[in-house]
Interface confidence: medium
């Protein structure tokens, strides 16, 4: 298709020349001579306009041949015509003098719409009203060949598709060619067929790669703002669906009481900075886009946007910062159409205190700067969570102010690794920091390969962690799985429309914040014969580090008065402790922690309780009394022995039964088991009778016992 006319991204002209034109007017392809035969059928198209001879405009009927060709609006010469689509020279009779006096010209401009779906050609007649009375139609014939071969042959007529162009007014017609996305890089072949009053004008063959003819939609979201350094930032976003980067043309005008300036800039970014902005000025801006790195067509201009600056400009207008930092505000002040010289500007805080002159800087004739050092946290004043910073002249302050938000970002993050070493839970609270409306807080972290080897710093590569607010007001974030020996550097980021602040970072090694599982198999007993509280336990499986143990023990009851005992021998599994009451129930709990002091104490184990049981033989037998009944003159008397049950601390810890030992000179020694009774009566018949009361428990009989000897004569004693 090397003989088709390559469509340019700018407007070009279809001209049909009167017969007195010579071939010199045409730009011949290399290698073709001027006397190339018209009958070759490849280089020009002859048009035969047939007008009705009855028309009042028409006289001097004659036969005329028109040469139709394309001329770029950036080209003085005319491209040589290709053949009509049937490959035949088309000669026709002209019944009008009009075409001998005026060139038949059409302006044509084509582009691919920004949505990359429709290829559009606009055909504008330069005859203006000349064809209005004739049946004026425009058709576009097109083909998207499957495979492009480097061949001068034209596709057959049957392969072309025809679209009817919409001529809303006769002078301008719109032709729409649908282009599949897959074919945007292919070559589209087209030609125009213009009919008017029975006359057919047919253009040479045109070729185009749609992707090279994209006319983007206008840029979107055009807006302006004053930057922190006092420039006007014009920003926009590129239209959607454009498959390549764009360049942009920005035109803006500045209108103030002192100056009017206009500018036109081409940029590849989606923003432009305008310096030296003035207070009390208006800026009108438009922007359009075009392909950056190849051919294309400028989009239409965006809708104009106007930005008006106030009489006092603060930059930045608001600052969000953290306690201890230094910040600066700048201001330009216009009063009664005159800019206040910067050396006359004074600064006030909350209209209550004048900021010392030592904190001012004259940046330029019109720009004043104030700096605040080592800032303290902003104290809320009613509903205001900021300090108002005013730029004033010597006599009065403008009602506009800048806003200063100072936040204490010292947020403590504490982490704990579970006893199974499978997850690390980190907690933090915002109760220490002043809440900022519409701010979000996020825990961010960076995991180093191993250890917390370097001082914690905010790493440029970090990840956010989801944290959830708990009922106690703390946020909780869970890391799972964990790398026990990796250093997790973490901090809280406060995100706000004014910027973001980071709390001081902290580095946590999961291995160093383990809260072990509590010791298991905790047992408590009072040892037999020795009489000590023996506590035993098993250490948890994790962590593998050496552990220290804490034991708490106390008399079981509603409110246990705990006593503490610490064990630093990691191998130890039991301990025996003296207790004052061997016959009481003791509650015992054990917990553990790494011996090197890192991490946390485990929870206390479930309590173990001692069981009250006999530890030793009773310390002594019961103290007893006797009652003697009977005739004082008789040799036989009834003796009743009475005693109180032994107390626990004497019986160690119980009495199963009492035994009475008797001794007489005649009958010798014998014993009587009285069970757990505390009263015993026997018959005293001999001169001397000795009795001893023994207390018996599961260990044995009391060793230290009371005894009583009865002998005559004796009176009744109570």
């Amino acid at each position: 298709f090397n003989l088709s006319y390559p469509i340019t991204p700018w407007r070009f002209k279809l001209s049909c020349m009167p017969p007195n034109s010579t071939y010199d007017y045409f730009l011949l392809p290399a290698g073709l001579s001027k006397n190339t035969s018209n009958s070759n059928g490849h280089y020009e198209t002859a048009v035969e306009p047939k007008f009705n001879s009855s028309g009042t405009h028409f006289s001097n009927l004659s036969k005329t041949t028109f040469h139709c060709c394309f001329r770029s609006e950036q080209d003085r010469n005319c491209s040589l015509c290709a053949d009509n689509i049937e490959g035949k020279t088309f000669v026709s009779t002209v019944n009008s003098l009009v075409f001998q006096q005026i060139d038949a010209n059409w302006n044509i401009q084509c582009w691919l719409k920004g949505d990359l779906k429709l290829f559009i050609c606009y055909v504008e007649s330069l005859f203006k009203n000349l064809f209005r009375n004739y049946n004026y139609k425009v058709h576009l014939l097109y083909v998207l060949p499957e495979v492009l071969e480097d061949s001068p042959l034209v596709p057959q007529k049957g392969s072309f598709q025809m679209v009817h162009c919409n001529c809303s007014v006769h002078e301008c017609c719109e032709c729409l060619v649908p282009v599949p996305t897959a074919k945007l890089n292919d070559t589209l072949l087209m030609c125009l067929k213009i009919t008017s009053g029975g006359v057919i004008f047919q253009s040479p063959l045109m070729s185009v790669q749609p992707i090279n003819m994209v006319k983007p939609d206008p840029p979107l979201g055009l807006h302006m703002e004053i930057t922190d350094d006092g420039n006007l930032k014009i920003s926009w976003s590129s239209p959607p669906l454009v498959p390549f980067p764009l360049q942009y043309q920005v035109k803006y005008s500045e209108n103030s009481t002192t100056v009017i300036r206009e500018a036109d800039k081409i940029v590849s970014a989606t923003s432009l900075l305008v310096d030296s902005i003035l207070p009390g000025s208006s800026y009108e801006v438009q922007v359009r886009g075009k392909r950056l790195d190849g051919p294309g067509i400028w989009s239409d201009w965006s809708t104009p946007r106007v930005f008006t600056t106030q009489d006092v400009i603060y930059f930045p207008p608001k600052i969000l910062t953290s306690v201890g930092s230094n910040v600066s505000f700048h201001c330009i002040y216009k009063k009664e159409n005159k800019i206040v010289p910067s050396k006359e500007i004074v600064w006030w805080m909350n209209l209550a205190e004048k900021i010392p002159q030592s904190q001012y800087d004259v940046v330029s004739d019109h720009v004043s700067k104030v700096t605040f050092f080592n800032l303290n946290e902003t104290k809320p004043r009613g509903k205001f969570t900021y300090d108002a910073v005013y730029c004033c002249n010597e006599h009065e302050c403008h009602h506009r102010y800048a806003e200063l938000y100072v936040i204490d970002v010292n947020i403590n993050i504490s982490c704990e690794t579970d006893g199974y070493l499978t997850k690390m839970t980190c907690r933090w609270s915002t109760s220490t920091i002043q809440s900022l409306a519409e701010s979000t807080l996020q825990l961010r972290y960076h995991r180093s390969s191993l250890y917390c080897s370097d001082i914690p710093s905010i790493h440029p590569i970090s990840e956010p962690k989801d944290c959830y607010l708990q009922s106690d007001g703390f946020y909780e974030c869970i890391f799972q799985p964990i790398f026990l020996l990796s250093g997790y550097t973490m901090w809280i980021r406060i995100n706000h429309s004014l910027g973001s602040l980071d709390s001081p970072p902290t580095c946590v090694l999961p291995d160093s914040v383990v809260k072990p599982l509590p010791p298991s198999s905790v047992k408590a007993e009072i040892t037999i014969n020795i009489g000590l509280l023996k506590i035993s336990w098993e250490k948890p499986v994790f962590p593998e580090n050496n552990l220290q143990f804490q034991i708490r023990y106390g008399l079981s009851g509603k409110e246990v008065q705990w006593k503490m005992y610490e064990v630093y021998d990691a191998k130890s599994k039991s301990v025996s402790l003296p207790v004052p009451d061997l016959c009481a129930v003791y509650a015992v709990q054990v917990r553990c922690k790494r011996l090197d002091g890192l991490g946390y104490w485990s929870n206390w184990s479930n309590p173990a309780y001692t069981v009250v049981m006999d530890i030793k033989v009773p310390m002594r037998g019961p103290e007893f009394w006797r009652i003697i009944n009977g005739d004082t003159m008789k040799k036989e008397k009834n003796v009743t022995l009475l005693w109180k049950p032994l107390m626990k601390n004497d019986s160690l810890c119980s009495v199963q039964r009492y035994v009475i030992n008797h001794h007489t000179s005649c009958n010798g020694t014998w014993s009587e088991d009285v069970g757990n009774h505390t009263k015993f009566t026997f018959l005293w018949t001999e001169q001397a009778h000795t009795v001893t009361v023994l207390a018996i428990n599961s260990i044995g009989a009391s060793v230290a016992n009371f005894n009583l000897t009865f002998s005559w004569p004796m009176s009744k004693v109570n």
Epitope: Y451, C452, D454, I455, L509
Partner: antibody, heavy 117, light 108 residues
């Protein structure tokens, strides 16, 4: 520029002790983890121990655990390695190294420790 | 622990030639936490590459590192006379930190 100057090497009998020192300059010593790495004669490199920037965390290779102690004095910009119960297999050139994420961006000149009866 | 195996033990090449040194890990090195060092006789090692492929400050661009997971490579595109030395790889993704056995690059 960063410098790590080592001292304390020498010949020592098995079972005895030795303390190596490493004086740092040219960087903020208290901001970085520090390591000891050793190299037995004619052999490759072996990591020995690390201490975190503030001294709160210390980790050791299994071969020296319980015998060697790494420590630092940030006020003196000095790193130490206390080596007890030395064995013949501890004979090596010992290097102190500045850690950065646990690779070693600067090394001392090395000091030879010979354990021999 | 992660065991690093370097190959070959010795590489005999001439100045101007390309050197390719291999380091294979017994298990995956997380986040490509692997470094390469050069050591000349009687000197301390010098850091060449960290994070598997990032050149340390002041290291010529003829040194490059690549690889991930368990297989890593140090390439010296054109050997200079001062490049003949022993090269060690080191992983710092798991405790304990471990080094490869080293590859000696000697003049042919």
């Amino acid at each position: 520029q960063v410098q790590l100057l080592q001292s304390g090497g020498g010949v020592v009998q098995p079972g005895r002790s030795l303390r190596l020192s490493c004086a740092a300059s040219g960087f903020t010593f208290s901001s970085y983890g520090m390591h000891w790495v050793r190299q037995a004669p004619g052999k490759g490199l072996e990591w020995v121990a690390v201490i975190s920037y503030d001294g709160s965390n210390k980790y050791y290779a299994d071969s020296v655990k319980g015998r060697f102690t790494i420590s630092r004095d940030n006020s003196k910009n000095t790193l130490y390695l206390q080596m007890n119960s030395l064995r013949a297999e501890d004979t090596a050139v010992y290097y102190c190294a500045k850690g950065y994420e646990n690779y070693f961006d600067y090394w001392g000149q090395g000091t030879l420790v010979t354990v021999s009866s | 622990e992660i065991v690093l195996t370097q190959s070959p033990d010795t590489l005999s090449l001439s100045p101007g030639e390309r050197a390719t040194l291999s380091c294979r890990a017994s298990q995956s090195v997380a986040s490509n936490y692997l470094a390469w060092y050069q050591q000349k006789p009687g000197q301390a090692p010098t850091l060449l590459i960290y994070n598997a492929s990032t050149r340390a400050t002041g290291i010529p661009d003829r040194f490059s590192g690549s690889g991930s997971g368990t297989d890593f490579t140090l390439t010296i595109s054109r050997l200079e006379p001062e490049d003949f030395a022993v090269y060690y790889c080191q992983q710092y993704s798991a405790s304990p930190l471990t080094f490869g056995g080293g590859t000696k690059v000697e003049i042919k």
